[in-house]
Interface confidence: medium
């Protein structure tokens, strides 16, 4: 379920945005850089898929959102949502923020201002 | 097999310092943070704080800051708990423990602080 | 600092009997919550961990639930082996705390 987020902006414009693009790339690619390239993750198999590649894509499809620099921070918390569940210590939890917060600048975006992961009602 | 082995039991005098090893093996160490937990005789749980096996970051509760310090050995995959200052007090089994779905326990090390 | 309210302190129950115990948190911690059981002169063990995964090979007779302020660990039938204290330990923020414990016991 997607929880309201309350930010700065358009913040229902980015939500539609983030809701057409396919984050899983973005989400696999993090796991991959936690979790290490030899393991498979959950339902993901994620060797099948190297890591580079999954950086591309992820970027591309973060590139689909008409306003990707103003709703990077949505797309952002989105995947701390979606894989919120999947983190079972709190070092994942840190790694996985930190690597999340790396992402626009791995995609040659300029990271957002400010933006808050937590976001999961607790969860994360 | 994944496992957390502590060092054995210590007796010291008050004032004395303390260093608890704790290795882990049958996991990748830098994967999982590592608590350290507290059992006074006759006790419940009191959770000393965590080390975060990749960034080397140590948390302390409030009532373990100062005389504890948590630090990390990844060449040879162990954790240490190091008590300086020693009060009678701190007389209690000290616990490794892994959080999460591989959540693993140390079976205790026994510190004894008696003049 | 987020604290965790254990009830009851002491059980006792027949074997065979479903068993429940509660743990209550001051704020919400989502399902950052595990179950530790510990025998007496052992070490502690995971049971449960976020809220309702069972540990592997811990029994299925253990079950947790909840979320946010308000948990529970269940033994569904009571067997002589589970005689033990069993503790609820939130681990939401960077900090983690423990609850008091209930021991479990054969009457």
């Known amino acids: 379920m997607r929880r309201e987020r309350g930010r700065q902006g358009d913040s229902s414009s980015c939500e539609r945005q983030v809701d057409r693009v396919n984050l899983k790339p973005c989400e696999q690619h993090i796991m991959q850089r936690i979790m290490g390239e030899q393991e498979q993750y959950d339902s993901y198999d994620i060797r099948s898929t190297r890591s580079s590649d999954q950086q591309q894509r992820c970027c591309d499809e973060l590139n689909e959102m008409e306003n990707t620099q103003r709703c990077m921070c949505e797309a952002l918390q989105q995947i701390m949502e979606n894989q919120c569940d999947r983190l079972q210590d709190r070092q994942m939890v840190q790694q996985f923020k930190r690597e999340l917060m790396n992402l626009p600048q791995q995609c040659n975006f300029r990271a957002p201002q400010r933006c808050d992961l937590d976001v999961s009602g607790g969860r994360c | 097999e994944f496992q957390l082995v502590q060092s054995g039991s210590e007796l010291r005098k008050p004032g004395a310092s303390v260093k608890v090893s704790c290795k882990a093996s049958?996991?990748?160490?830098?994967?999982?943070?590592m608590n350290w937990v507290r059992q006074a005789p006759g006790q419940g749980l009191e959770w000393m704080g965590w080390?975060?096996?990749?960034?080397?970051?140590?948390t302390y509760a409030q009532d373990f800051t100062g005389r504890f310090v948590f630090s990390l050995d990844t060449s040879v995959n162990t954790a240490y708990l190091e008590i300086s200052g020693l009060k009678a007090e701190d007389t209690a089994v000290y616990y490794c423990?892994?959080?999460?779905?591989?959540?693993?326990w140390g079976q205790g090390t026994t510190v004894t602080v008696s003049a | 600092d987020i604290q965790m309210t254990q009830s009851p302190s002491t059980l006792f129950a027949s074997v065979g009997d479903r068993v429940t115990i509660t743990c209550r948190a001051s704020?919400?911690?989502?399902?950052?919550l595990a179950w530790h059981q510990q025998k007496p002169g052992t070490a502690p063990k995971v049971l449960i961990y976020?809220?309702?995964n069972l540990k592997s090979g811990v029994p299925s007779r253990f079950s947790g639930s909840g979320s946010g302020t308000d948990f529970t660990l269940t033994i569904s039938s009571l067997q002589p082996d589970d005689v033990a204290t069993y503790y609820c330990?939130?681990?939401?923020?960077?900090?983690?705390?423990f609850g008091q414990g209930t021991r479990v016991e054969i009457k």
């Open positions: 976020k809220a309702s």
């Open positions: 080390i975060n096996t990749n960034t080397a970051k140590p």
């Open positions: 423990a892994t959080d999460g779905s591989e959540g693993s």
């Open positions: 704020q919400s911690i989502g399902t950052w």
């Open positions: 330990q939130q681990y939401n923020t960077y900090l983690g705390t």
């Open positions: 049958g996991y990748t160490f830098t994967k999982y943070g």
